[in-house]
C-alpha cells in the first residue's frame, strides 16, 4: 500500500518534500515515477538511478529516500502530484498529494 500526506502546503519561494511511503513484506520497489499533473518530474530506477526532467532540473532534488525535494516554489506549482511505485512481484501502486503554494507572509 501507499501512504502519503494527502494535502500539504508550503510558502512561495520555499521548498517542500514530496514523499510517498510504500509498505510491503514481499514486493521490491523497482521504479518510482513522480508527476506533476501529467508532466513528468522525475523517475527513480533501482538499476539506473535518478532521472530528473530537464524542465525541473534546477528546482527538483532527489530525496530524501524515494521522495523529491521541490525548491523555489511558485504559485503555479499548486496542484496534484502523483507517485507511481512499480514493484516486483506486487505490481503498480499509486499515491496522490495535493500541494498548495501560499503567498509568503
Amino acid at each position: 500500500t501507499i501512504d502519503t500526506k494527502r494535502n500539504i502546503s508550503a510558502e512561495e519561494g520555499g521548498s517542500v518534500i514530496l514523499q510517498c511511503h510504500f509498505s510491503s513484506d514481499t514486493a521490491e520497489v523497482t521504479q518510482v515515477d513522480w508527476k506533476q499533473q501529467d508532466q513528468l518530474l522525475a523517475i527513480y530506477s533501482v538499476d539506473l538511478g535518478w532521472h530528473v526532467a530537464s524542465v525541473f532540473s534546477d528546482r527538483v532534488v532527489p530525496g530524501p529516500s524515494l521522495g523529491l525535494t521541490f525548491q523555489s516554489l511558485t504559485m503555479n506549482d499548486t496542484g496534484e502530484y502523483f507517485c507511481t511505485y512499480h514493484t516486483y512481484p506486487g505490481g503498480i501502486y499509486k499515491g496522490r498529494i495535493f500541494l498548495k503554494v501560499q503567498e509568503s507572509s
Epitope: 535518478w50 532521472h51 532527489p62
Partner: antibody, heavy 119, light 107 residues
C-alpha cells in the same frame, strides 16, 4: 561463464548509421539492466547509454542523445545500439557491460567493438 | 549532468607505496560511486561499488571511502600489477558519468 560479445563495428562515413549488437550468455539476461560504454583512442571512459531489464527507463549521454538508440531483445539475450548521424568524435571502442544487480557497478564487460567514423 | 573530477591525473609511485586517488562530484551522489582499474588493451575491471564495497576477487589492499561529493580510492601497498589507469563513475543520476582517469605509473 558470464560472457558479453559485441559485434557490428567498422569503418563508416560521417552522417551514416551503424548498429552494434551485444550477445549475452552465462546469466539470466532478462533480469539485468545493460549498458554501453565507449572509449576513444587514447582517451578515458565515457558512458553512452543504459536500459532497464524491461526497457522501462532508458538513459543517454548528452553527446549521443537524439542520435543513438539503445534497445534489447530478452528472448534473444541481445543488446543493441543503433547509431545514426555518426560524427568523427564517435570514433571509439564500444563496450557492452552488465551491472552488479541493484548496486550499479559494471562487473562484466565485453571485449569491445571498434567504430571508426571517417571519410 | 554530474561532473566527476579526479586528482591527480597521474601519479608516479614505487612498489610498496600507499597511493590515494580522489574523485569529487559536482553534486551530491550519496554513495553511488564505483571505481575501475584499466590496463592497456583491456576492458575495465570493477574494483569498488557503493563507494566502499569491495568487488568479489579484488585484493583487500584496495579500499574506497566517502559519500556525498568527496570520494577516495586507496591502494595500501602498491603491487607491480597495480600500475594501470583508475576511473571513478557515478550512478546516482542519469546520465551516468566517469571521471577523467588517474594513471598510476612506475617511479
Amino acid at each position: 561463464q558470464v560472457q558479453l560479445v559485441e559485434s557490428g563495428g567498422g569503418l563508416v562515413q560521417p552522417g551514416r548509421s551503424l548498429r552494434l549488437s551485444c550477445a549475452a550468455s552465462g546469466f539470466t539476461f532478462r533480469d539485468y539492466a545493460m549498458h554501453w560504454v565507449r572509449q576513444a583512442p587514447g582517451k578515458g571512459l565515457e558512458w553512452v547509454s543504459g536500459i532497464t531489464w524491461n526497457s522501462g527507463l532508458i538513459g543517454y549521454a548528452d553527446s549521443v542523445k537524439g542520435r543513438f538508440t539503445i534497445s534489447r531483445d530478452n528472448a534473444k539475450n541481445s543488446l543493441y545500439l543503433q547509431m545514426n548521424s555518426l560524427r568523427a568524435e564517435d570514433t571509439a571502442l564500444y563496450y557492452c557491460a552488465k551491472p552488479v544487480p541493484r548496486l550499479r557497478g559494471l562487473d562484466v564487460w565485453g571485449q569491445g567493438t571498434m567504430v571508426t567514423v571517417s571519410s | 549532468d554530474i561532473q566527476l573530477t579526479q586528482s591527480p591525473s597521474s601519479v608516479s609511485a614505487s612498489v610498496g607505496d600507499r597511493v590515494t586517488i580522489t574523485c569529487r562530484a559536482s553534486q551530491g551522489i550519496s554513495s553511488w560511486l564505483a571505481w575501475y582499474q584499466q590496463k592497456p588493451g583491456k576492458a575495465p575491471k570493477l574494483l569498488i561499488y557503493g563507494a566502499s564495497s569491495l568487488q568479489s576477487g579484488v585484493p583487500s589492499r584496495f579500499s574506497g571511502s566517502g559519500s556525498g561529493t568527496d570520494f577516495t580510492l586507496t591502494i595500501s601497498s602498491l603491487q607491480p600489477e597495480d600500475f594501470a589507469t583508475y576511473y571513478c563513475q557515478q550512478a546516482f543520476y542519469l546520465p551516468w558519468t566517469f571521471g577523467g582517469g588517474t594513471k598510476v605509473e612506475i617511479k
